[in-house]
Interface confidence: low
Amino acid sequence: DAHKSEVAHRFKDLGEENFKALVLIAFAQYLQQCPFEDHVKLVNEVTEFAKTCVADESAENCDKSLHTLFGDKLCTVATLRETYGEMADCCAKQEPERNECFLQHKDDNPNLPRLVRPEVDVMCTAFHDNEETFLKKYLYEIARRHPYFYAPELLFFAKRYKAAFTECCQAADKAACLLPKLDELRDEGKASSAKQRLKCASLQKFGERAFKAWAVARLSQRFPKAEFAEVSKLVTDLTKVHTECCHGDLLECADDRADLAKYICENQDSISSKLKECCEKPLLEKSHCIAEVENDEMPADLPSLAADFVESKDVCKNYAEAKDVFLGMFLYEYARRHPDYSVVLLLRLAKTYETTLEKCCAAADPHECYAKVFDEFKPLVEEPQNLIKQNCELFEQLGEYKFQNALLVRYTKKVPQVSTPTLVEVSRNLGKVGSKCCKHPEAKRMPCAEDYLSVVLNQLCVLHEKTPVSDRVTKCCTESLVNRRPCFSALEVDETYVPKEFNAETFTFHADICTLSEKERQIKKQTALVELVKHKPKATKEQLKAVMDDFAAFVEKCCKADDKETCFAEEGKKLVAASQAALGL
């Protein structure tokens, strides 16, 4: 499958529009601070070069790898050292070290201004004036803020973004039509980015084997009627796709993802009965649909797992002959029978099974040793079940905002060294598990909740990795991918933490809070709550609730006052004094 010119091959496979969009995403994900116009210039240069290679694959430089071509282009940016500091040193390296160097400098939390949404009329005018530039800007702004966003999926988001503007800018009430669609895209986009970030972390921090295990479990749940060999083939192909995207090889990734979707649809009879509708859609929608497709029904009369994996006299023989294949079969068989389990739970069970076989297959009587292995699974299954039950009860009792606050307090006490914005962001997202998953019946709660929590805790891990401040976070994040959530759940109050000095400035509020959206106002209050806990980590729930209730009343009162600023200044001082007294600060 060797091509004389890789760049010509990808240009022909993907078409000019997708080629340009993917190169823009790639460059924006690497050079996150560069202005839009600079990126467009680089993309146009690469595209013109690609066209010369399509015309003549033997032309000068057309035989170079995509990493070499793109890296060379990125290294022409004159302001590289001024803007990116030591990232400029990457340019002195040869491939593949240069690309690895660029990857290491991707920033999960770039210092970029918040995206402010202009007025609807302004957006519609910009869309009509220059549709192409408008959509490119969308790709650029998302890609630079989410340097691991799944590139072919971002093309799908851009297509929906374009459709929303095409439809709504002609509507009688543009805002009523457009704003809910943009909100939905924003929320789905954040979720998609976080899910992909976990896949990349899994590959980069824990290796291909960890990712493949995750994929075996998830695809076996989704396609329980497919044979193990079929699932294995899909896992291999999916691993290649995600390895490419996480490695910045976006053209190859998008091309291979399209090939995988094509293969799945051509072989849907041996994969799943749920794929029919997906496979009738155009490419981007098709790939998205397959990725989100519901689990197929489990085959009837599946035999007991014990026969092959506990009772058989060949267990150790089969394990010794091909360890990963045998463990893969175990995971496949267990997962296809348990759509009610989270993927991480299935991986914990497989790890327990592997550990038991490692120990027992070297023992005098292996069968006697591993005969009770399935009994070891019981506590592993019950732990997330109980946790989800308790937290869903708490969520139903408190509602989302107060449930988030309970988690804010819980996590601030566990890891008070973590920055306040990170604690607020992560705890708010953890709290969303309630409205996302607690509405589901028992059989769907665990896969929804625990796999979502894995995604959110990965956000904490990648943000913390940038500026590590807590050994406990580092430990939970690096020891085991599948045990991250149990590790964080098991953390108690950090007794070694020295409370933060009280700073009245942190609790000084102004009239601008009155004009904020409900969400932004919540974030302000939750920021204050985290700071309170950092000052007084031993404060009781009741004490914190009293202070927060007073705070809510204070904001409400001053926002209704004629002279808001004076009210905030005077009443604020009283509130701080009262809070200090209540908490013994």
Epitope: N61, D72, T76, A78, L80, R81, A88, D89, C90, C91
Partner: nanobody, 115 residues
């Protein structure tokens, strides 16, 4: 094999001028941005100036702005640094690098500004 060979250094009086050259080989010179970097005795390397692959875009460290000019000739695979109004603090070994790296990959050329 990537090779960068600098020349044009020497001893010059304060206020004088020098033109440094850097001959490149072993890579597609016209595809890369290039930089000049200097290292004074007993100090770490200091980035001086950079130019993009086409020569259209240039950038300078504050300490040399208005006095130094970076240029390139892609046909000759050569990078230049025109240094005017030289000061004693410009004394250093000057070397060219690919991109804007400050990791030294060549011998460099000595520039000494002294009366």
């Amino acid at each position: 094999q990537v090779q960068l060979v600098e020349s044009g250094g020497g001893l010059v009086q304060p206020g004088g001028s020098l033109r440094l050259s850097c001959a490149a080989s072993g890579f597609t010179f016209g595809s890369f941005g290039m930089s000049w970097v200097r290292q004074a005795p007993g100090k770490g390397p200091e980035w001086v100036s950079a130019i993009d692959s086409s020569g259209a875009d240039t950038i300078y460290a504050e300490s040399v702005k208005g006095r130094f000019t970076i240029a390139r000739d892609n046909a000759k695979k050569t990078l230049y640094l025109q240094m005017n109004s030289l000061k004693p603090e410009d004394t250093a070994v000057y070397y060219c690098t690919i991109g804007q790296s400050i990791s030294r990959g060549s011998q460099g050329t000595q520039v000494t500004v002294s009366s």
